[in-house]
């Protein structure tokens, strides 16, 4: 058998994104080791002296933790023995973005992997029919985005059409002076058609769909993080 620390173990991380003001997770897995007391997890951040988080002998050791992470980090303690070294980050800040290293030492050996953590704001859009307008129009709203996204409209009937001339998009700074509310209005819409409002920045892409008929309004929205994965 290998002498502790002499062998390399596989450590895998996944690029991920954090939504500022909410909880985030920096994903990291490693070859499991049933000896919990022999597992050391260290999270480091490029450009930061001190540790983001350290977990060893079955508990947190925050004696060397950098103050910018104080009170905001935790591992999934009950999942460490099965190889989960992912880090929970409470109340993600814009400044949490950067390159992180997940370093693992177990009785089988040691290993590390880097991940790129992006931070921003992203939220689901909601489309409603704007009955107050002089002509039938649609209003697409999403409460929190950062950096400023692009907004585009599309329709099922007029595929490939450019709606920039018949839409108006505004960005309103939220009270915390970082994120913005996105509002886009599409004018001169026709019934029995499905319209899509697409909001995108370098972190996430969100789409809201609405189908308006004489008898009903159907809505659907989805959000996907970009460049997430190994």
């Amino acid at each position: 058998f290998g002498i502790s620390g002499k062998h390399f173990i596989t450590v895998t991380t996944f690029t991920s994104a954090g939504n500022i003001g909410e909880d985030g997770t920096l994903s990291c897995t490693f070859e499991p080791d049933i000896k919990l007391n022999g597992i050391v997890i260290q999270w480091l951040k490029e450009g930061i002296k001190g540790l983001v988080h350290e977990f060893k002998e079955g508990k947190d050791d925050l004696s060397q933790q950098h103050e910018m992470f104080r009170g905001r980090t935790a591992v999934f303690a009950d999942q460490v023995v099965v190889g989960n070294a992912s880090l929970r980050l409470k109340n993600v800040q814009l400044t949490d973005a950067g390159t992180y290293t997940c370093y693992i030492r177990t009785s089988k050996g040691k290993g590390n992997a880097n991940l790129e953590y992006k931070t921003g704001a992203f939220s689901m859009p909601e489309i409603n029919v704007d009955y107050n307008a002089s002509s039938e129009s649609l209003r697409c709203e999403a409460p929190r985005w950062f950096p400023q996204p692009t907004v585009a409209w599309a329709s099922q009937v007029d595929q490939g059409a450019n709606f920039s001339e018949v839409s108006n998009t505004s960005f309103e700074l939220n009270s915390e002076n970082v994120t913005m509310k996105v509002v886009s209005v599409l004018y001169n819409v026709t019934i029995n058609n499905t319209y899509s409002c697409m909001i995108e920045n370098d972190i996430a892409k969100a789409t809201g769909d609405i189908k308006v008929t004489d008898s009903e309004v159907k809505r659907r929205s989805q959000l996907q993080l970009l460049n997430s994965g190994p």
Epitope: E22, D60, R70, G71
Partner: antibody, heavy 121, light 107 residues
Framework: QVQLQQSGAELMKPGASVKMSCKAT????????IEWVKQRPGHGLEWIGE????????TYNAKFKVKATFTADTSSNTAYMQLSSLTSEDSAVYFC??????????????WGQGTSLTVSS | QAVVTQESALTTSPGDTVTLTCRSS?????????ANWVQEKPDHLFTGLIG???NRVPGVPARFSGSLIGDKAALTITGAQTEDEAMYFC?????????FGGGTKLE
């Protein structure tokens, strides 16, 4: 031992502002979150928000974002909550509580004794 | 915003085991909701009992335990004592805010 000592009862006029305090002793103030909670008879407990002392990091319940402002002074180990534009709806008992966020658990453990606020003309 | 529901009142006898539950309107309660249980005694005396679903706050008697039962968070008092007569509140975390339940009066 750990203690959270809150300021005394307040009687305020509608439209006024009030600032209540929560003094922490017996632990490292900057390592724990301070949570603020509202209790009104028949309304149970309502979470107002939280602050991590020593940082500018706060989280507010959307309902209280305009109403409440949290600050903390690490030199005196005291957290503050200011409530503005008071109305009768703000009449309640307000609590501060310590919240620990760590790998082994996430818990509210110690609570202050509460500050009673009455808003009346 | 989510609604967290608890039994309004439960009755037990000394020595019995009683379970209080906490349901979320958004679906099953998971460990990511960090379910907390807090006890309130007369004169606004609050004490934290359980955090992170199943971790007892240091100093809390072993008769108090937390778990997930089905799609709900649960607080079980094994061998209830007279001094356990109180209001019990659960709180669930929803990614960036806490929501408290209405409380269970245990008699």
């Amino acid at each position: 031992q750990v203690q959270l000592q809150q300021s005394g009862a307040e009687l305020m006029k509608p439209g006024a502002s009030v600032k209540m305090s929560c003094k922490a002793t017996g632990y490292t103030f900057s390592s724990y979150w301070i949570e603020w909670v509202k209790q009104r008879p028949g309304h149970g407990l309502e979470w107002i928000g939280e602050i991590l002392p020593g940082t500018s990091i706060t989280t507010y319940n959307a309902k209280f974002k305009v109403k409440a402002t949290f600050t903390a002074d690490t030199s005196s180990n005291t957290a503050y909550m200011q409530l503005s534009s008071l109305t009768s709806e703000d009449s309640a008992v307000y609590f501060c509580a310590r919240y620990y966020f760590g790998s082994s658990s996430f818990y509210f453990d110690y609570w202050g004794q509460g500050t009673s606020l009455t808003v009346s003309s | 915003q989510a609604v967290v529901t608890q039994e309004s009142a439960l009755t037990t006898s000394p020595g019995d085991t009683v379970t209080l539950t906490c349901r979320s309107s958004t679906g099953a309660v998971t460990t990511s909701n960090y379910a907390n249980w807090v006890q309130e005694k007369p004169d606004h005396l609050f004490t934290g009992l359980i955090g992170g679903t199943n971790n007892r706050v240091p100093g809390v008697p072993a008769r108090f335990s937390g778990s997930l039962i089905g799609d709900k968070a649960a607080l079980t008092i094994t061998g209830a004592q007279t001094e356990d007569e109180a209001m019990y509140f659960c709180a669930l975390w929803y990614n960036n805010h806490w929501v408290f339940g209405g409380g269970t009066k245990l008699e």
